[in-house]
């Protein structure tokens, strides 16, 4: 990973576009810390892998964790 | 359409300074970090800069640190390359260009849209 | 540093040709990484295909990317009149840098 200690937040862009759940691998949601001050949200897709960044204020990515929490809450016992 | 234009080139002494800018369009420029690349006359492209969306990080090709700074204003929709001590091997054409949607550091989606770029000069 | 190494310098070809260019990392670089951009005289570069072997938004499906580690890629699989070109290859690296090979120039035989 491109990594130096000098990087402070993972996203050097982030997408407002919709994610359909069933294209998603995982979900990743890093809180806010004292190396980078906002939540990230990290999308990795089924198809090859891809990571992308999502922008945690657009409302189609809200809509997103609602679907995804529901379908968590659903299989969990 | 998605555009970028920049503005600010031109003819400058060597040791003087230059402040070039990109003006975005077409996209919520807020969203996406932008770079700087350069061409001198005939030869290949150099990356030289760039920013996160959010101005959080900045990093720069080595023979520009300490004399180049990225900055961004997006209130505005427009990105700056603060150029001081200038010198003749700084000439070029410098393009301003957008990083792919949802780009980070554990993936990359590429420079997918670019100005037509602004040519400096340096001489004496 | 990585240093990425385009071959050949030049390519001749014709109109409904296969081109095959190369780009090489002096080290191993993540497919994920990998882009491929076409720059014609006079005009700015274009996107042509990221993480090694995924075409940009709008880019003909002629275009192909492929490879791993340090040998990647790029097929041209019929020469159209408007691929005559110079075509760069480029990895993000640590640090962050944004490295882009020297060039391969297509031109018309």
């Known amino acids: 990973v491109p990594l130096s200690r000098t990087v402070r937040c993972t996203c050097i862009s982030i997408s407002n576009q919709p994610v359909n759940p069933r294209s998603l691998e995982k979900l990743e949601i890093i809180p806010a810390s004292q190396f980078c001050p906002r939540v990230e949200i990290i999308a990795t897709m089924k198809k090859k892998g891809e990571k992308r960044c999502l922008n945690p204020e657009s409302k189609a990515i809200k809509n997103l964790l609602k679907a995804v929490s529901k379908e968590r809450s659903k299989r969990s016992p | 359409q998605m555009q970028l234009v920049e503005s600010g080139g031109g003819v400058v002494q060597p040791g003087r300074s230059l402040r070039l800018s990109c003006t975005a369009s077409?996209?919520?420029?807020?969203?996406?970090?932008m770079h700087w690349v350069r061409q001198a006359p005939g030869k290949g492209l150099e990356w030289v800069a760039v920013?996160?969306?959010?101005?959080?990080?900045?990093f720069y090709v080595d023979s520009v640190k300490g004399r180049f700074t990225i900055s961004r204003d997006n209130s505005k929709n427009t990105l700056y390359l603060e150029m001081n001590s200038l010198r003749a091997e700084d000439t070029a054409i410098y393009y301003c260009a957008r990083e792919g949607d949802g780009s980070g550091i554990y993936y990359y989606y590429g420079m997918d849209v670019w100005g037509q770029g602004t040519t400096v000069t340096v001489s004496s | 540093e990585i240093v990425l190494t385009q071959s050949p310098g030049t390519l001749s070809l014709s109109p409904g040709e296969r081109a095959t260019l190369s780009c090489r990392a002096s080290q191993s670089v993540s497919s994920s990484y990998l882009a491929w951009y076409q720059q014609k005289p006079g005009q700015a570069p274009r996107l042509l295909i990221y993480g090694a072997s995924s075409r940009a938004t709008g880019i003909p499906d002629r275009f192909s990317g492929s490879g791993s580690g340090t040998d990647f890629t790029l097929t041209i699989s019929r020469l159209e009149p408007e691929d005559f070109a110079v075509y760069y290859c480029?990895?993000?690296?640590?640090?962050?840098?944004?490295?882009f090979g020297p060039g391969t120039k297509v031109d018309l035989s």
């Open positions: 920013i996160w969306f959010d101005g959080m990080n900045k």
């Open positions: 077409g996209f919520t420029f807020s969203n996406n970090g």
């Open positions: 480029q990895q993000y690296g640590s640090s962050p840098i944004f490295t």
